[in-house]
């Protein structure tokens, strides 16, 4: 079943998806779509990359990470309740039926009404790159990947702050990571 991610109305949502290019700059086409992954490509495409660049995108959807290094995580700007649902990240590895498909479920919660501003950690800002904790196939990896200067205590604190959002589990087991080559 889909890994679940949460965001509040008005925030930016972050849906992680990674692959490791076989060689630097040796990119693989990727598409993001609203709806579960169909047989080919993505349904209701919101963003697409080719071997060189992002070649199609729609407003509010962008890649915040370095997609040239395989970080094809999707950021959805200023989410509304209508953004809830399943999203497909598809990594189109050349070959016979080689595509890797990931279905990620986004749950949007109504914004909390607070009487006075309180300190809230923005997960995307504080921790913009998901841990690449699970590879596929023989090249299984367990790596923290390319993270900002943040120690394990901070990660643990962030995980505690976000336990409600199930993202804590994803620090352990992100389903949208693949190593190529």
């Amino acid at each position: 079943s889909e890994v679940e991610y949460r965001a509040e109305v008005g925030q930016n949502a972050y849906l992680p998806c990674f692959y490791t290019p076989a060689a630097p700059g040796n990119l693989v086409p990727v598409c993001w779509g609203k709806g579960a992954c169909p047989v080919f490509e993505c349904g209701n495409v919101v963003l697409r990359t080719d071997e060189r660049d992002v070649n199609y995108w729609t407003s509010r959807y962008w890649l915040n990470g370095d997609f040239r290094k395989g970080d094809v995580s999707l950021t959805i700007e200023n989410v509304t309740l209508a953004d809830s649902g399943i999203y497909c990240c598809r990594i189109q590895i050349p070959g016979i039926m080689n595509d890797e498909k990931f279905n990620l479920k986004l749950v949007i919660k109504p914004a909390k009404v607070t009487p006075a501003p309180t300190r809230q950690r923005d997960f995307t800002a504080a921790f913009p790159r998901m841990l690449t904790t699970r590879g596929h196939g023989p090249a299984e990896t367990q790596t923290l990947g390319s993270l900002p200067d943040i120690n394990l205590t901070q990660i643990s604190t962030l995980a505690n702050e976000l336990r409600d959002s199930r993202l804590a589990n994803d620090l352990r087991d992100s389903g949208a990571t693949i190593r190529i080559g």
């Epitope: 047989v39 080919f40 349904g43 039926m97």
Partner: antibody, heavy 123, light 107 residues
């Protein structure tokens, strides 16, 4: 006007080979996924194989992938299906079809089909 | 593989009738369902995609509905040219699979 014209069908003995071709015109061929679908006499439709825009990604019915090879030549606006070790159960009309496409859609359904070419495998 | 089961296998109706053909998927396919019409000796024609979107040039008497595992194609008022075979096709799981077809005949 979009046109897909299949050729290369015919009578072949079991164990033999055939190469089907599909000539495309009336659209930018390299922008579209292409697919082969077959239909045995008096039977329903069966998906055979598909290929992405540039030919780098291919998809097959599991039971056929060791014997059939899909390919394309975008410079010639042509799609091919190489069929080896043919069996009687491969007897069918083979259709070439175009994956429906526009930016923001996926090519998982087929908006134009050729007229089909009949492949008969019999001794 | 995802199995697609159409019912009925054949159907006799008259011009002007309202007819509904159903298609059941063996597992959830969301809205990833397509309907085609095929006349004898001809190639299939795209009618409806994504369960309910009418293809370009298809008359409005055709409509599709459903999601998940249950889908239907309805013709609100049969015309003589509608007598044909109809197939559903799922495009959620590999391989793409079609229903066995429904033959719509003149009563």
């Amino acid at each position: 006007e979009v046109q897909l014209v299949e050729s290369g069908g015919g009578l072949v003995k079991p164990g033999g080979s055939l190469r089907l071709s599909c000539a495309a015109s009336g659209f930018t061929f390299s922008d579209y996924y292409m697919t082969w679908v077959r239909q045995a006499p008096g039977k329903g439709l069966e998906w055979v194989s598909s290929i992405n825009y540039d030919g780098r990604n291919t998809y097959y019915l599991d039971s056929l992938k060791s014997r059939f090879t899909i390919s394309r030549d975008n410079a010639k606006n042509s799609l091919y299906l190489q069929m080896n070790s043919l069996r009687a159960e491969d007897t069918a009309v083979y259709y070439c079809a175009r994956g429906y496409y526009y930016y923001g859609s996926s090519p998982n359904y087929f908006d134009y089909w050729g007229q089909g070419t009949l492949v008969t495998v019999s001794s | 593989d995802i199995q697609m089961t159409q019912s009925p296998s054949s159907l006799s109706a008259s011009v002007g009738d309202r007819v509904t053909i159903t298609c059941r998927a063996s597992e959830n396919i969301y809205s990833y369902l397509t309907w085609y019409q095929q006349k004898p000796g001809k190639s299939p024609k795209l009618l409806v995609y994504n369960a309910k979107t009418l293809a370009e040039g298809v008359p409005s008497r055709f409509s599709g509905s459903g999601s998940g595992t249950q889908f239907s194609l309805t013709i609100s008022s049969l015309q003589p040219e509608d007598f044909a075979n109809y197939y559903c096709q799922q495009h959620y799981g590999t391989p793409l699979t079609f229903g066995q077809g429904t033959k719509l005949e003149i009563k």
